[in-house]
Interface confidence: low
C-alpha cells in the first residue's frame, strides 16, 4: 500500500498526460485525482507508464470504485486490464460487446488467462445467452471457446448462433457437449439441401443419434473416417453393414485400419460375419 503523502506544490495533475511518467509512485498517489483518472482512462494507454505506476493507478480506481468499476471505465482500461485479478473482474457488470472486444484485444495472442475467462463468464451471464454476435467475437479470439463451456452453458446457445461456428471451434469438444450442440445445428441448417447440409452438420455429428445416421446413409454423403471415429458408439452400434457402407461410400476401406478402435471395434462385434464379409475387408467379428 502506498503511503498517503501531500502532493508537492505545483505537481497536482490537471489532466492525464505524458508528464506523469516522470512522477514517482508516491507522487502519482498524492497528485492524481481518482475521478480525473476515471474520466480520462482512454489516455492511459497512450502513455508509457511502468508496471509499478500502473499499480498505483489501479489502486486509485479501486478506492474510487470499491464495488467494481463502471462500464465507462472498464471499456477504456486497455493494458491496465492485465493488472486486474479474477476477483476484481467478478465485481463488474459488462454488457457492451464493444467493451468485451476492447479487453480481448489487449490479451490478443496470449493463452486465455483466468482474467479473460472470468470476464467472458461475467459477460455471458449478464446477457443471459450466447447470441450470434458474442459467439462470433469469442470464437474469433479463442477458437476453443465453445468447447470450454459445460453442457448446461451450451444449452443457452440459440440455434441461430450455430452459423458462427467453424469446424475448428469444435476440435476439443467432448461427446456430451456435442450432444447439446447437434440438435441446435440440425435446426439451424434444416433448410439446406443435402450436400450443403452435410458439409455444415459434419462437425457436429458426434452428437447425432442412430436415426439421423441412418437417414444420412441414404444421401450419398461419403463420410470420412475421421468423422466416423468421432460418432457416438451407442449411435453407431445399431447400424447395419449396408448402412455403414452407404454412409462411408469410398471411405469404407478405412474401417480395416480402425478395426481395433472404438466405435469400429464395438460395431464389428455386433455384426454377423457373413455381412462383414460382403465388405471384402477381412474384418473379423
Amino acid at each position: 500500500e502506498v503511503e498517503k503523502t501531500a502532493c508537492p506544490s505545483g505537481k497536482k495533475a490537471r489532466e492525464i498526460d505524458e508528464s506523469l511518467i516522470f512522477y514517482k509512485k508516491w507522487e502519482l498517489e498524492a497528485c492524481v485525482d481518482a475521478a480525473l483518472l476515471a474520466t480520462q482512462m482512454d489516455r492511459v494507454n497512450a502513455i508509457p507508464f511502468t508496471y509499478e505506476q500502473l499499480d498505483v493507478l489501479k489502486h486509485k480506481l479501486d478506492e474510487l470504485y470499491p464495488q467494481g468499476y463502471p462500464e465507462s471505465v472498464i471499456q477504456h482500461l486497455g493494458y491496465l486490464f492485465l493488472k486486474m485479478s479474477p476477483e476484481d473482474i467478478r465485481k463488474w457488470n459488462v454488457t457492451s460487446l464493444e467493451t468485451l472486444k476492447a479487453l480481448l484485444e489487449v490479451n490478443k495472442g496470449h493463452e486465455m488467462s483466468p482474467q479473460v475467462a472470468t470476464l467472458i463468464d461475467r459477460f455471458v451471464k449478464g446477457r443471459g445467452q450466447l447470441d450470434k454476435d458474442t459467439l462470433d467475437t469469442l470464437t474469433a479470439f479463442y477458437p476453443g471457446y465453445l468447447c470450454s463451456l459445460s453442457p448446461e452453458e451450451l444449452s443457452s446457445v440459440p440455434p441461430s448462433s450455430i452459423w458462427a461456428v467453424r469446424p475448428q471451434d469444435l476440435d476439443t469438444c467432448d461427446p456430451r457437449q456435442l450432444d447439446v450442440l447437434y440438435p441446435k445445428a440440425r435446426l439451424a441448417f434444416q433448410n439446406m439441401n443435402g450436400s450443403e447440409y452435410f458439409v455444415k452438420i459434419q462437425s457436429f455429428l458426434g452428437g447425432a443419434p442412430t436415426e439421423d445416421l441412418k437417414a444420412l446413409s441414404q444421401q450419398n454423403v461419403s463420410m470420412d473416417l475421421a468423422t466416423f471415429m468421432k460418432l457416438r458408439t451407442d449411435a453407431v452400434l445399431p447400424l447395419t453393414v449396408a448402412e455403414v457402407q452407404k454412409l462411408l461410400g469410398p471411405h469404407v476401406e478405412g474401417l480395416k485400419a480402425e478395426e481395433r478402435h472404438r466405435p469400429v471395434r464395438d460395431w464389428i462385434l455386433r455384426q454377423r460375419q457373413d455381412d462383414l464379409d460382403t465388405l471384402g475387408l477381412g474384418l473379423q467379428g
Epitope: P86, E87, P114, T118, G144, S148, L149, S150, E153, T172
Partner: nanobody, 124 residues
C-alpha cells in the same frame, strides 16, 4: 446433488510424487469437479489448483507452480492432481471442489460441492 470422491493420498517422502484423483457422480452435467484446495492442521483451507471445462485453462497457487499439475477427463468426470517434488509443507488434507462456471478460479466461494478430503503426508 453432486458427490465427490477423492483418492490417491498417502504417506510419501520429501521429493516424492503422488497423484490424487477426484471422481464426481450425480448431477455432473451442470457441476463438474474442477479444483483442489488443501487444509493443513491449524490452518485455513487454501487454494491449490483449478482447471476450466475445456481442460486447457488452469490456475495454480504460487507455492505449487511448476511442481503440481491439474488435469481432467470428460467421460469419468474426474479431475487429477499430479504432485511432484513434494515438500513437508505440502502435508495437508486435500479437498476436491466442483462448480458451475467454466473459468478456473481460486475463489472458494465459486464452488458449490466439496469432497470429504484425502490425507497427504510428506515426511522429511
Amino acid at each position: 446433488q453432486v458427490q465427490l470422491q477423492e483418492s490417491g493420498g498417502g504417506l510419501v517422502q520429501a521429493g516424492g510424487s503422488l497423484r490424487l484423483s477426484c471422481e464426481a457422480s450425480g448431477h455432473t452435467d451442470s457441476y463438474y469437479p474442477k479444483a483442489w484446495f488443501r487444509q493443513a492442521p491449524g490452518k485455513e483451507r487454501e487454494f491449490v489448483a483449478s482447471i476450466g471445462w475445456g481442460g486447457r485453462m488452469t490456475a495454480y497457487a504460487d507455492s505449487v507452480k511448476g511442481r503440481f499439475t491439474v488435469s481432467r477427463t470428460y467421460a469419468k468426470n474426474t479431475v487429477y492432481l499430479q504432485m511432484n517434488s513434494l515438500k513437508p509443507e505440502d502435508t495437508a488434507v486435500y479437498y476436491c471442489a466442483a462448480g458451475i462456471g467454466w473459468a478456473p478460479t481460486a475463489d472458494s466461494g465459486e464452488y458449490d460441492y466439496w469432497g470429504q478430503g484425502t490425507q497427504v503426508t510428506v515426511s522429511s
